[in-house]
Interface confidence: medium
């Protein structure tokens, strides 16, 4: 807590610049008005501010805004938002993708911060769901964010939301966040041709059931096995060897590197030997 | 015995075509997939392109797409490359190959691309 | 795209000695990993596929093996004939992807 002191003849800060960095703490605390900071936040970053002195700016603007900071002054804090905690950040009310872009960029190149998941919670909040435009950003700055949701979240999600979603921001989604996902893409890719279609849905196959798989089995697709290995159990186990022939196309001769791996082992455990045997692959049920 | 055969290769400037084959025997071009890879002089290989004639699918490398087309006519039990756009850095030694696994490979056939 | 990372790029060996090939893969590639042959002028022979299973008509001085997104091309003891360049590849993902090859020479 930095003591309230007089501020020092002609030392009174007239606007935010340089010559502000050489005021020790004290003297900021006592020469800087807080509304003139808070009406020219965009230039305190454009000034080397010790951490100590970024302290005093901060409880500043605190005391000003107890209740929270308004979206003018949030937009502009820069580095100054690595000094909030999320208590403070609970406090605000972000409805604009400028703002959030602008403190994503401060954090950009580092791990998803606490402070950062507490500022998007907010802004996916207040704006009550996940559109695309704000998903297109979220995965730009951070490609494992939708895998991060849980399933009830990502059920706020709306199809054409998924226009957004890049094979990448998957990668590491489980079953049941893909289970929630999949007929969202099915629903926004639905008008699309065979081949296009595919390659728009592969991503969220993981999420699939039977009926679909055996649907794309009779469309020619050629799934390669990345996908195929990522597809349920449940919905692999029904497929006869016809539909997995021709669900992979010339892939499934990779069967035999997968033998020992679900869901290709307990697939063969269903099949007939007789069957598997049309492959030509040695597979051993 | 199986056995694949290139030809079309030669010399040609750039931004010229050039249609490559590869007539396959003892198999049924069907039902197996075909590849081009390429080697460029005193370089490694370069995977291009692929077809699946029982399902007409077909992939491409970043560096070929848009200007290379693989097909399959599958009453000749032959492969084609069409290279269209060509540059000088497409100039190479290219196999066609059989399989998802490579198993059976041409001899191959140089496109040379030289003003 | 997946890189397939060979080394080495070159190697001496004598005939009778122990050589070993590696590649590496930027991401999970499963045993979706074959091994080529090639000698100058020819075209690539299969030798090696699944990471493991030694193709038919390979002598069994070639053997492949994978620890995660490491893959190994072992000749047990070197041929007057085996003296060529090897190639990885991985068939797990379009695109297709070789390793940039290994010269093994003769000491």
């Known amino acids: 807590e930095v003591e309230k002191t007089a501020c020092p003849s002609g030392k009174k800060a007239r606007e935010i610049d340089e010559s502000l960095i050489f005021y020790k703490k004290w003297e900021l605390e006592a020469c800087v008005d807080a509304a003139l900071l808070a009406t020219q936040m965009d230039r305190v970053n454009a000034i080397p501010f010790t951490y100590e002195q970024l302290d005093v700016l901060k409880h500043k603007l605190d005391e000003l805004y107890p209740q929270g900071y308004p979206e003018s002054v949030i937009q502009h804090l820069g580095y100054l938002f690595l000094k909030m905690s999320p208590e403070d950040i609970r406090k605000w009310n972000v409805t604009s993708l400028e703002t959030l872009k602008a403190l994503l960029e401060v954090n950009k190149g580092h791990e998803m911060s606490p402070q950062v998941a507490t500022l998007i919670d907010r802004f996916v909040k207040g704006r009550g769901q996940l559109d695309k435009d704000t998903l297109d950003t979220l995965t730009a700055f951070y490609p494992g964010y939708l895998c991060s949701l849980s399933p009830e979240e990502l059920s706020s999600v709306p199809p054409s939301s998924i226009w957004a979603v890049r094979p990448q921001d998957l990668d590491t989604c489980d079953p049941r966040q893909l289970d929630v996902l999949y007929p969202k893409a099915r629903l926004a890719f639905q008008n699309m041709n065979g081949s296009e279609y595919f390659v728009k849905i592969q991503s969220f196959l993981g999420g699939a059931p039977t009926e679909d798989l055996k649907a794309l089995s009779q469309q020619n697709v050629s799934m390669d096995l990345a996908t195929f290995m990522k597809l349920r159990t449940d919905a692999v186990l029904p497929l006869t060897v016809a539909e997995v022939q021709k669900l992979l196309g010339p892939h499934v001769e990779g069967l035999k590197a997968e033998e020992r791996h679900r869901p290709v082992r307990d697939w063969i455990l269903r099949q007939r030997q007789d069957d598997l045997d049309t492959l030509g692959l040695g597979l051993q049920g | 015995e199986v056995q694949l055969v290139e030809s079309g290769g030669g010399l040609v400037q750039p931004g010229g075509s050039l249609r490559l084959s590869c007539a396959a025997s003892g198999f049924n071009l069907y039902s197996y997939s075909m590849h081009w890879v390429r080697q460029a002089p005193g370089k490694g290989l370069e995977w291009v392109a692929y077809i699946y004639p029982y399902s007409g699918s077909t992939y491409y490398a970043d560096s070929v797409k848009g200007r290379f087309t693989i097909s399959a006519d599958t009453s000749k039990n032959t492969a084609y490359l069409q290279m269209n756009s060509l540059r000088a850095e497409d100039t190479a030694v290219y196999y066609c190959?059989?399989?998802?696994?490579?198993?059976?490979w041409g001899q191959g056939t140089l496109v040379t691309v030289s003003s | 795209d997946i890189q397939m990372t060979q080394s080495p790029s070159s190697l001496s060996a004598s005939v009778g000695d122990r050589v070993t090939i590696t590649c590496r893969a930027s991401q999970s590639v499963s045993s979706a990993v074959a091994w080529y042959q090639q000698k100058p002028g020819k075209a690539p022979k299969l030798l090696i596929y699944?990471?493991?299973s030694l193709y038919s008509g390979v002598p069994s001085r070639f053997s492949g093996s994978r620890s995660g997104t490491d893959f190994t091309l072992t000749i047990s003891s070197l041929q007057p004939e085996d003296f060529a360049t090897y190639y990885c590849?991985?068939?797990?993902?379009?695109?297709?992807?070789f390793g940039q090859g290994t010269k093994v020479e003769i000491k």
């Open positions: 590849q991985q068939s797990y993902y379009w695109l297709f992807t």
């Open positions: 190959a059989r399989g998802y696994g490579m198993d059976y």
């Open positions: 699944s990471a493991s």
